[in-house]
């Protein structure tokens, strides 16, 4: 049961369930917005973001966006609602416990994005091919 004094705060808008009907709770994500990064040509990187923030809404997940152009590399870390596009892209992998980077087409830059739904999961961003979601073992991890 929901504790009584939470019911004022927990109206019908706030009670969010996943695909299995389990109640979703506000998540902790790294949240540094856009920062310069030294993450390049690596299988995985830590965000080096020292801010762990509680997401505003229970449905929000952690997101990381890695961008490289002629001048610099940046890493963006935020909370975001997967029902809404981010940088014009749908968050397809929001149910994943790990932040596995996927390349997106953006003119003039290299653009990777990942989303995930476990606490601080956007602290460790994974580029390695071995984590590609075509791997059936990973799908088991994500959806079990």
């Amino acid at each position: 049961t929901i504790p009584p004094h939470v019911q004022k705060s927990v109206n019908n808008d706030m009670i969010v369930t996943d695909n299995n009907g389990a109640v979703k709770f506000p998540q902790l994500c790294k949240f540094c917005d856009v920062r310069f990064s030294t993450c390049d040509n690596q299988k995985s990187c830590m965000s080096n973001c020292s801010i762990t923030s509680i997401c505003e809404k229970p449905q929000e997940v952690c997101v990381a966006v890695w961008r490289k152009n002629d001048e610099n590399i940046t890493l963006e870390t935020v909370c975001h609602d997967p029902k809404l596009p981010y940088h014009d892209f749908i968050l397809e992998d929001a149910a994943s416990p790990k932040c596995i980077m996927k390349e997106k087409k953006k003119p003039g830059e290299t653009f990777f994005m990942c989303s995930c739904s476990s606490d601080e999961c956007n602290d460790n961003i994974i580029f390695s091919e071995e984590y590609n979601t075509s791997n059936p073992d990973l799908l088991l991890v994500i959806f079990q």
Partner: antibody
């Protein structure tokens, strides 16, 4: 009515590991509607968050403890414990194992009475 | 981590008077601020969460306000049992942090 009770040795020697147990009665720690954790309060001072968890999610630790803290969970006994390694006099405090609603995680709506741990040789 | 600064450190008032306690955050904590009351030898007790919501069983004389970096706890008319130490706590950025406390003492 869910209640928590802290237990453990009142005296620990410097450089040793402090071990405390929190027993939950009147409910289950595997109820994910509630978050659990540890907070401490040095004598005459303010409160410090040590770490917290809710069932099915990883435990969050305060980075200031530099990996000295470990929280483990035994759902069969409805208990969770705190181990704090390499203690010094600065770790002398009343240790609480509070509970809060996960929907507003970080808010504490129920506290045990706390247990005083003194670090001294 | 976010630093919470409470003022004043001590507030000397008489029963029946109005108490106004302040909590200022080093950066925005949105509305994620709670207030706790602690009496000597006891654990803290939740009064207010998310800036202005009273916890179960808390009398209406306790009210909270504010958002961003500046918050206030008001006790409209002090009862004898209200003399205690009051802590604010933020949960916007983790770890959650507490202010150093304001002691409300009998004048």
């Amino acid at each position: 009515q869910l209640q928590v009770q802290e237990s453990g040795p009142g005296l620990v020697k410097p450089s040793e590991t402090l071990s405390l147990t929190c027993t939950v009665s009147g409910g289950s720690i595997s109820n994910s509607y509630f978050s659990w954790g540890w907070i401490r309060q040095p004598p005459g001072k303010g409160l410090e968050w040590i770490g917290s968890f809710y069932y099915g999610e990883k435990t969050y630790y305060n980075p200031s403890l530099k990996s000295r803290a470990t929280i483990s969970i035994d759902t069969s006994k409805s208990q969770f414990s705190l181990k704090l390694s390499s203690v010094t006099a600065a770790d002398t405090a009343v240790y609480y194992c509070p509970r809060g609603p996960t929907m507003i995680r970080g808010v504490i709506d129920s506290w045990g009475q706390g247990t005083l741990v003194t670090v001294s040789s | 981590e976010i630093v919470l600064t409470q003022s004043p450190a001590t507030l000397s008032l008489s029963p029946g008077e109005r108490a106004t306690l302040s909590c200022r955050a080093s950066q925005s904590v949105r509305s994620y601020l709670a207030w706790y009351q602690q009496k000597p030898g006891q654990a803290p007790r939740l009064l207010i969460y998310d800036a202005s919501n009273r916890a179960t069983g808390i009398p209406a004389r306790f009210s909270g306000s504010g958002s961003g970096t500046d918050f206030t706890l008001t006790i409209s008319s002090l009862e004898p049992e209200d003399f205690a130490v009051y802590y604010c706590q933020q949960r916007s950025n983790w770890p959650p942090t507490f202010g150093q406390g304001t002691k409300v003492e009998i004048k």
